[in-house]
């Protein structure tokens, strides 16, 4: 029950996180004009990964897309790439985790397969979250660097009479959305990985069995089942050899736990 809850919660948290990463990537407010120097401006600038916008106090907003690819800063391209990779990995992770959910029954899929998929999706969520956090952090670092550079060159002109105020940009809402979303995706991924451990069938210490064949006694040592960690080739938990022998554990093992998803 705790495993199902952990897995389900991990899925929901990751889902919210990935939705947040998508939202942050699409948002225009990655950087917003710093109004400290000119709080009464009638024109407010803000920029996203894909376009820059100008909002006038009249309510009129004009946005222009970055129609060049080669002319954009390498850092911006890197941030775009990180966010897209984060979204793609997150989306695949979500798809995998849907099938891995313990509460959803798909054919005769066994726990080991679900554990495998849960771990895979968990790792994907972790990487997705890290990509988003990295992307947002790179952009934030870029902003901080530019902010102090523009502050150093804030005023130029003849004896300070004419002030050419450089537009400084500060953190926009998208950065905070991205950080939170990345964190949620990361947490969701960790929860999925934790749930995976609970889903994986534990190795059973099977008791020794006696196999009687034409008068000879052959003692089979425990380990008739190959213990599955979810990564072994024998994922179906079939006996390596079954010549009609039965362990004491198996006698009353109906219905098997593998019959339930």
């Amino acid at each position: 029950m705790a495993v199902t809850a952990c897995q389900g919660l991990g899925f929901v948290v990751s889902l919210i996180g990935i939705a947040g990463i998508i939202a942050a990537t699409c948002m225009d407010q990655w950087s917003t004009q710093d109004l400290y120097n000119n709080p009464v401006t009638a024109v407010f600038n803000y920029q996203g990964l894909w376009r820059s916008c100008v909002r006038e106090s009249s309510g009129f907003t004009e946005c222009r897309g970055y129609f060049t690819l080669l002319g954009l800063p390498a850092m911006l391209q890197a941030v775009r790439a990180l966010m897209i990779v984060g979204i793609v990995l997150g989306a695949i992770g979500l798809l995998v985790s849907i099938f891995a959910l313990k509460c959803i029954r798909i054919g005769s899929m066994e726990d080991s397969a679900k554990a495998n998929m849960t771990l895979t999706s968990g790792i994907m969520f972790i990487v997705s979250g890290l990509c988003a956090i990295a992307g947002v952090s790179v952009f934030a670092n870029m902003l901080v660097t530019n902010f102090w550079m523009s502050t150093a060159n804030m005023y130029t002109g003849m004896g300070g009479m004419v002030q050419t105020v450089q537009t400084r940009y500060t953190f926009g809402a998208a950065l905070f959305v991205g950080w939170v979303a990345g964190g949620l995706t990361l947490i969701g991924g960790v929860m999925m990985c934790i749930a995976c451990r609970g889903l994986a069938p534990e190795e059973t210490n099977y008791k020794a069995v006696s196999y009687h064949a034409s008068g000879h006694s052959v003692a089979y040592k425990p380990g008739g089942f190959k213990a599955s960690t979810g990564f072994g080739s024998n994922t179906k938990n079939k006996k390596i050899y079954d010549g009609g022998a039965r362990t004491e554990d198996e006698v009353q093992s109906y219905p098997s736990k593998h019959d339930y998803v």
């Epitope: 000119n38 401006t41 009638a42 024109v43 820059s52 006038e56 106090s57 009249s58 222009r64 105020v165």
Partner: antibody, heavy 118, light 113 residues
Amino acid sequence: QVQLKESGPGLVAPSQSLSITCTVSGFSLTSYGVHWVRQPPGKGLEWLGVIWAGGSTNYNSALMSRLSISKDNSKSQVFLKMNSLQTDDTAMYYCARDFTTATGFDYWGQGTTLTVSS
Amino acid sequence: DIVMTQSPSSLSVSAGEKVTMSCKSSQSLLNSGNQKNYLAWYQQKPGQPPKLLIYGASTRESGVPDRFTGSGSGTDFTLTISSVQAEDLAVYYCQNDHSYPFTFGSGTKLEIK
């Protein structure tokens, strides 16, 4: 066609309040902003404030404490209220239309003369 | 507040002559976000309200004769009348549209000889 017409009291005693109405036609106040500008006799233009299409206002900081701009979209009227009038508030008061900040005040009213005198 | 300084304060020219008047702002009126200059020019004839001539520093308002040209960027702006006509007798104001309050210059009075 686009028209703006100011109407005011003409003469006001010092320390009294002023209310000027700008009645517009040919456009909607839900699409355009309206600015108030005054011009003392023989002097230059002074911007007082604006009410934008959405209802937000901005004022000249020097007059903000005694200035108020409001509007009634259904009546196509914009109101300028100013209190604690002094003799140096004597001026021609204009209302002007503006679509966006970048496009200037494209239509002006003929103005209304205000004299502050006892 | 942004201070708008106009020069000269007045000038007298003959009809047909070219006229140039200057407007300087204490802060840049160029917005980096859209590369627009938030400056307008107005013409005020005696006994009349001001009339918009130029907005965005260089865009001529519809109906304005093409002899009126606005130029400049940042803090330095110019209004040029290529061939002055008798009806151009007026006071010309520049205005900051970038930051509140939307300050006007003191004006340049154009007189015809």
